[in-house]
């Protein structure tokens, strides 16, 4: 049974040239986390493995950066950043949870941070 | 059912290198990660790096780091470790194994090739 | 890097003994923890995962328990084709490491 709810960093906003930080917390389940998958849409960014540590795809290795801790670092951020990005965590034994979290890139300079949200 | 067949046993010179061979068979490549493991002769294990074929990227042990090179070719569903600037304390047996990605990660290294033997001597 | 720490680093044992090997962490590590037999001339085969999980095809007289530190792995009772080489490994810190492992001979 899956018990563990996954709280991430919910709707945020950064700007153009700028970083942000994509962060997810899985909680309330003792499950081993031993892999998790950062995706856009259905391309995968970056690999975090219990045996192998953090791989980051090629494509995306100049503007991705592993961390802090299991989240992820978009930098050199284009309007093109912007969408939905996926936190998915492979776990023993319950199985997969995936957190979403939605991220606009502003040509402004009026980058406001959403609140905080949990998926269960 | 997957299967890592080696390449064959070598002797090397101090100073050299070596590049051993991993090939999978009975198996999707792209979905699983390969370990190296060495171990020397009367001695225990030792965790070289792994390389994420999808990625085509590896992680090393610091030990290692700057004299070992995995790589992998997708094509041919074959694995690649080289190790350079060899010494005496590196005639070990080397293994290379399969680790599962995603949602079975939590296996660990379930499948091993049948390990090939290094010899460095003068 | 984690040290793993096995004992005894070798035991001698009959056939039918209930034969506990340990494995301690020099910090905790939840339940990441394998364990792999060896035998002579032979590859490492996997026999338990996530410290208790016994992997397909192994048979249901070995076990494993622990978390955090302190780890067992229990033969309950010891069959000829037992007799090898044990190791435990972490893998909750990059890099994984292996203990020095645990050399069960017949008696």
């Known amino acids: 049974m899956m018990t563990g709810t996954i709280e991430t960093t919910g709707n945020i906003s950064a700007e153009k040239g700028g970083s942000i930080i994509l962060q997810c917390h899985l909680s309330s389940t003792t499950a081993q986390v031993t892999q998790v998958n950062w995706e856009q849409q259905d391309q995968l960014l970056a690999i975090c493995n219990a045996d192998l540590g953090w791989h980051i795809s090629p494509s995306f290795k100049d503007r991705v950066a592993p961390g802090p801790g299991l989240g992820l670092t978009l930098q050199s951020l284009t309007v093109n950043d912007t969408g939905e990005y996926f936190c998915i965590y492979h776990t023993y034994p319950d199985g997969t949870y995936t957190g979403r979290i939605f991220l606009e890139v502003l040509e402004s300079s009026v980058a406001e941070h959403g609140a905080r949200f949990q998926i269960p | 059912q997957v299967q890592l067949v080696q390449s064959g046993a070598e002797v090397k010179k101090p100073g050299s290198s070596v590049k051993v061979s991993c090939k999978a068979s009975?198996?999707?490549?792209?979905?699983?990660?390969i370990s190296w493991v060495r171990q020397a002769p009367g001695q225990g294990l030792e965790w070289m790096g792994g390389?994420?074929?999808?990625?085509?990227?590896?992680n090393y042990a610091q030990k290692f780091q700057g004299r070992v090179t995995i790589t992998a070719d997708e094509s041919t569903s074959t694995a690649y470790m080289e190790l350079s600037s060899l010494r005496s304390e590196d005639t070990a047996v080397y293994y290379c194994?399969?680790?599962?990605?995603?949602?079975?990660?939590?296996?660990?290294?379930?499948?091993w090739g049948q390990g090939t033997t290094v010899t460095v001597s003068s | 890097d984690i040290q793993m720490t096995q004992s005894p680093s070798s035991l001698s044992a009959s056939v039918g003994d209930r034969v506990t090997i340990t494995c301690r962490a020099s910090?905790?590590?939840?339940?990441?923890l394998n364990w792999y037999q060896q035998k002579p001339g032979k590859a490492p085969k996997l026999l338990i995962y996530?410290?208790?999980s016994l992997q397909s095809g192994v048979p249901s007289r070995f076990s494993g328990s622990g978390s955090g530190t302190d780890f067992t792995l229990t033969i309950s009772s010891l069959q000829p084709e037992d007799f090898a080489t044990y190791y435990c490994?972490?893998?909750?810190?990059?890099?994984?490491?292996f203990g020095g492992g645990t050399k069960v001979e017949i008696k």
């Open positions: 194994a399969r680790l599962h990605l995603g949602s079975s990660a939590y296996y660990g290294m379930d499948v």
């Open positions: 009975g198996g999707t490549f792209s979905s699983y990660a």
């Open positions: 390389i994420i074929p999808i990625f085509g990227t590896a």
């Open positions: 910090q905790s590590i939840s339940s990441y």
């Open positions: 996530a410290a208790s």
């Open positions: 490994q972490q893998r909750y810190v990059f890099p994984p490491t």
